[in-house]
């Protein structure tokens, strides 16, 4: 079966709709919003989970400083163009023929403009920096079992090798996760860092796009580890072009 | 098609290494994990490490407590695995595998490398 | 390390034979097990990926189901040439990845 092997679901995507018309019967899933098959052994591309969700009813000194030009989402929602391979399309534009430029995982890197605004290619995020604050402890976590378990959940939850987990730093309470993933070291079946760090942001928010599992249970040697806020920066291979007046 | 091949039988001392190689040829040797994996003879497999061509990057078995290195050569689409200090408990046949980021399937496999260690 | 536990480690069947191989985890691994064939004398082959996933050229009379810690192995009608041993492996966690002892599948 293509997605879960006895009740046709998708394990990774909540926001699919399945049924059992794949080659043979297979149980085969398809994303809200765009129709697209997804491989539910693995997360589904940030596009086409954006894709579903605008489709949805509505209801200190070793802690990395952001570099000048890290990106932050503060835009927010939006529905998005995606590629054939559920990949963000360059150029983004609203209904209102506003539109903008965005890199990998979606997040705008230019001012807006009108139809007239070219994006010549997709800028590729290689660098992500999740930064999180927890809810006081007794004591401190202690640093080496914090990465572990951080490297841990980033692989067995959102199958992202460790190899892609640059760094955990922390500075109670504190916790910095960086991801590093260039275009050349992705080999075939790795995850992409900028969806691994979208699934991890939703689990954190309580919002979680894995079917039937769990809400994310971080422990470090049986602590609980709950996260007050997340800020996540978003480096990308070219830096971005904003105007002077946004700056100010 | 796809296939890995592999560098001849070898006899080693107690003490010696070995360096193994895997040739790889029909897909591109950078996109693909690769792995090594041994059978000693009428047991079962035991993995020892992996290695990403396009970085070099390499994880191991801890089992084999920095005997074990793995690298690459992406002129040739080669890679190579080195053991250290051999016993003769590292008597084997040793494999490389094309490997899989998500499912950490083997899909392809080298035919083989013997390696005897013996006084 | 997650422990992979193959049963039986041996068995007899003769050729027409349904025949059902188990493999079981130490714990959860989801459904990323794989399963292999493995002839005296040659590498393993790829059989089933991520616990069902038939690997391109296997016959269908392979099939793989489970999830979880239970995972089983099936060949619905054996064939002459089917006679080997079977591998089960794990790729969930962090490394190690770990294989079971394996199962030899013999002619009655």
């Known amino acids: 079966h293509t997605a879960a092997q006895d009740n046709c679901t998708c394990p990774t995507n909540k926001m699919t709709v399945c049924s059992p018309d794949g080659p043979g019967g297979r149980c085969q899933c398809r994303a809200l919003g765009s129709g697209m098959a997804v491989d539910c052994s693995t997360l589904t591309s940030k596009c086409l989970l954006l894709k579903a969700r605008m489709s949805a009813p509505k209801n200190a000194r070793t802690l990395v400083r952001p570099s000048e030009h890290a990106l932050v989402d503060n835009d927010g929602l939006y529905d998005p163009d995606c590629d054939p391979e559920g990949r963000f399309k360059a150029r983004q534009c609203n209904q209102t023929s506003v539109c903008w430029c965005v890199n990998s995982v979606g997040v705008r890197r230019t001012d807006k403009g009108d139809l007239s605004l070219r994006c010549d290619e997709l800028v590729r995020t290689h660098h992500i920096l999740i930064d999180l604050r927890h809810r006081p402890t007794a004591g401190a976590f202690n640093h080496s079992d914090l990465d572990a378990e951080l490297r841990r959940l980033f692989r067995e939850r959102y199958r992202l090798h460790p190899k892609f987990v640059a760094a955990v730093h922390y500075e109670q309470p504190t916790i910095q996760i960086e991801l590093r993933q260039n275009t050349s070291q992705k080999a075939a079946g790795d995850v992409d860092i900028g969806d691994a760090a979208y699934y991890f942001e939703r689990d954190i928010k309580g919002e979680s796009l894995f079917q039937g599992r769990g809400g994310l249970d971080l422990r470090v040697r049986g602590e609980p580890l709950q996260v007050e806020r997340t800020l996540i920066y978003y480096l990308d291979e070219i830096p971005p072009k904003f105007s002077m007046k946004r700056l100010t | 098609q796809v296939q890995l091949v592999q560098s001849g039988a070898e006899v080693k001392k107690p003490g010696a290494s070995v360096k193994v190689s895997c040739k790889a040829s029909?897909?591109?040797?950078?996109?693909?994990?690769m792995h090594w994996v041994r059978q000693a003879p009428g047991q079962g497999l035991e993995w020892m490490g992996e290695i990403t061509p396009s970085d070099g990057y390499t994880s191991y078995n801890q089992k084999f407590k920095g005997r074990v290195t793995i690298t690459r050569d992406t002129s040739t689409s080669t890679a190579y695995m080195e053991l250290s200090s051999l016993r003769s408990e590292d008597t084997a046949v040793y494999y490389c595998a094309r490997g899989h980021g998500n499912y950490v399937s083997f899909d392809y496999w080298g035919q083989g490398t013997l390696v005897t260690v013996s006084s | 390390d997650i422990q992979m536990t193959q049963s039986p480690s041996s068995l007899s069947a003769s050729v027409g034979d349904r025949v059902t191989i188990t493999c079981r985890a130490s714990?959860?691994?989801?459904?990323?097990l794989n399963w292999y064939q493995q002839k005296p004398g040659k590498a393993p082959k790829l059989l089933i990926y991520y616990a069902s996933r038939l690997h391109s050229g296997v016959p269908s009379r392979f099939s793989g189901s489970g999830s979880g810690t239970d995972f089983t192995l099936t060949i619905s009608s054996l064939q002459p040439e089917d006679f080997a041993t079977y591998f089960c492996?794990?790729?969930?966690?962090?490394?190690?990845?770990?294989f079971g002892q394996g199962t030899k599948l013999e002619i009655k």
């Open positions: 492996q794990q790729g969930y966690t962090l490394p190690p990845y770990t």
């Open positions: 029909g897909y591109t040797f950078t996109s693909y994990w």
């Open positions: 714990q959860d691994i989801s459904n990323y």
